[in-house]
């Protein structure tokens, strides 16, 4: 697993819709793979975390003034949709093939 | 200033190019306003931090399992360019009007 000492990476995060109270309108699936971005954005930032120039700058400033400026943060940089069966306003079960932005496709340092 | 207890927001971060070793190729300006995204992504995520669905989900999971899943992170969601004077391969001072991605325009929870 990606702890605080490991580099920014995508890790598993199974989300149960009942746990977050969304089972009241999402019928299926009961749970899904959301993934989570975990780990640190350490110097030097590798290409695989696709750093922006600002993230590179912030990393260099953090290196010089660690108490003044934080590191860049490991976050989703690309999201994927999932398919969900939900109840519409009339209570009709409806399939949404592309419920956007629900699952991490890529992580990076921002 | 935006500490750990405050909500995600854009704060000032003056970056001196000498401090980060970029003065070897950036002639001017000597420093610039990079800004930094600081503060927490607390439940409920406000509209002004433009949360993705994944960030909302992660926030809800963190609320239920705070030791298992981290909060969403306050990061730059939109960046702006700055203008820099640099030396080209022939040593000719050249102005790049739009050196992209150097300054934070907007922060959000991701």
């Amino acid at each position: 697993s990606a702890g605080a000492g490991s580099h920014c990476q995508k890790t598993s995060l199974r989300v149960n819709f009942e746990d977050i109270g969304w089972d009241s309108w999402i019928i299926a699936p009961k749970e899904y793979e959301a993934y989570e971005c975990k780990g640190g954005c350490f110097f030097p930032l590798a290409d695989d975390v696709t750093p922006t120039k600002h993230a590179i700058v912030q990393t260099l400033v953090h290196l010089k003034f660690p108490t003044k400026v934080g590191k860049a943060c490991c976050v989703p940089t690309k999201l994927s949709p999932i398919s969900v069966l939900y109840k519409d306003d009339m209570g009709v079960p409806t399939l949404k093939y592309h419920y956007e932005g629900m699952s991490v496709a890529e992580c990076g340092c921002r | 200033s935006a500490g750990a207890g405050s909500h995600c927001q854009k704060t000032s971060l003056r970056v001196n190019f000498e401090d980060i070793g970029w003065d070897s190729w950036i002639i001017a300006p000597k420093e610039y306003e990079a800004y930094e995204c600081k503060g927490g992504c607390f439940f409920p995520l406000a509209d002004d931090v433009t949360p993705t669905k994944h960030a909302i989900v992660q926030t809800l999971v963190h609320l239920k399992f705070p030791t298992k899943v981290g909060k969403a992170c306050c990061v730059p969601t939109k960046l702006s360019p700055i203008s820099v004077l640099y030396k080209d391969d022939m040593g000719v001072p050249t102005l790049k009007y739009h050196y992209e991605g150097m300054s934070v325009a907007e922060c959000g929870c991701r």
Epitope: - | A28, V84, V92, T94
Partner: antibody
Framework: EVQLVESRGGLVQPGGSMRLSCAAS????????MNWVRQAPGKGLEWVGH??????????HYAESVRGRFTISRDDSKSSLYLQMNSLKTEDTAVYYC??????????WGQGTLVTVSS | DIVMTQSPDSLAVSLGERATINCRAS??????????MNWYQQKPGQPPKLLIY???NQGSGVPDRFSGSGSGTDFTLTISSLQAEDVAVYYC?????????FGQGTKLEIK
């Protein structure tokens, strides 16, 4: 070694025309803005105009004193800069310098060529 | 157009002494935290040569005795210890706006 060599100027009558050229070597000509700067006898420097890059659609800008009479062009394949001067006036008498550089500075200069407008 | 005015028009300084030339712009030539101000040296019978750019940066091969300072509308070129080979006309120039404009020049001679 960077070199800019202007063609020979000469004597031309008022109302007449002359074309100057500038041959460049020692640098990637197509990467640089090219300028003409002139200097009347015993006077200071005056920017005449410039031509930008292919990526700028070879945009040209001119000093008010020559606008509509002078035309700057370039041929990147020949690393050459040109100045077509029409409707010449006595006050156009000057040493004309070809100067290469960036969007910020004149970095490379030719030795200059004298154009005399006189009857 | 931005008008550049140099002072003095001419200057005579003893060898080894300091020479100072001023340049004033009719409006600020600073933008984006950058000064769009350059200085050129023109020796007799020669084309101009870039001396100082961005107000305070030395051009390639320029001796350390040449320095520039200033921002906004007021700029200074300083020669810390005049040498015989520094006899020339010095021009300031702005590149903030087209048309790029020069000062009228300052003739530097040895006293």
């Amino acid at each position: 070694e960077v070199q800019l060599v202007e063609s020979r100027g000469g004597l031309v009558q008022p109302g007449g025309s002359m074309r100057l050229s500038c041959a460049a070597s020692g640098f990637t000509f197509s990467n640089y803005w090219m300028n003409w700067v002139r200097q009347a006898p015993g006077k200071g420097l005056e920017w005449v105009g410039h031509i930008r890059l292919k990526s700028d659609n070879y945009a040209t800008h001119y000093a008010e004193s020559v606008r509509g009479r002078f035309t700057i062009s370039r041929d990147d394949s020949k690393s050459s800069l040109y100045l077509q001067m029409n409707s010449l006036k006595t006050e156009d008498t000057a040493v004309y310098y070809c100067a290469g550089g960036s969007n910020y500075v004149f970095a490379f200069w030719g030795q200059g060529t004298l154009v005399t407008v006189s009857s | 157009d931005i008008v550049m005015t140099q002072s003095p028009d001419s200057l005579a300084v003893s060898l080894g002494e300091r020479a100072t030339i001023n340049c004033r712009a009719s409006e600020s030539v600073d933008n984006y935290g950058i000064s769009f101000m350059n200085w050129y040296q023109q020796k007799p019978g020669q084309p101009p040569k870039l001396l100082i750019y961005a107000a305070s940066n030395q051009g390639s091969g320029v001796p350390d005795r040449f320095s520039g300072s200033g921002s906004g509308t007021d700029f200074t070129l300083t020669i810390s210890s005049l040498q015989a080979e520094d006899v020339a006309v010095y021009y300031c120039q702005q590149s903030k706006e087209v048309p790029w404009t020069f000062g009228q020049g300052t003739k530097l001679e040895i006293k």
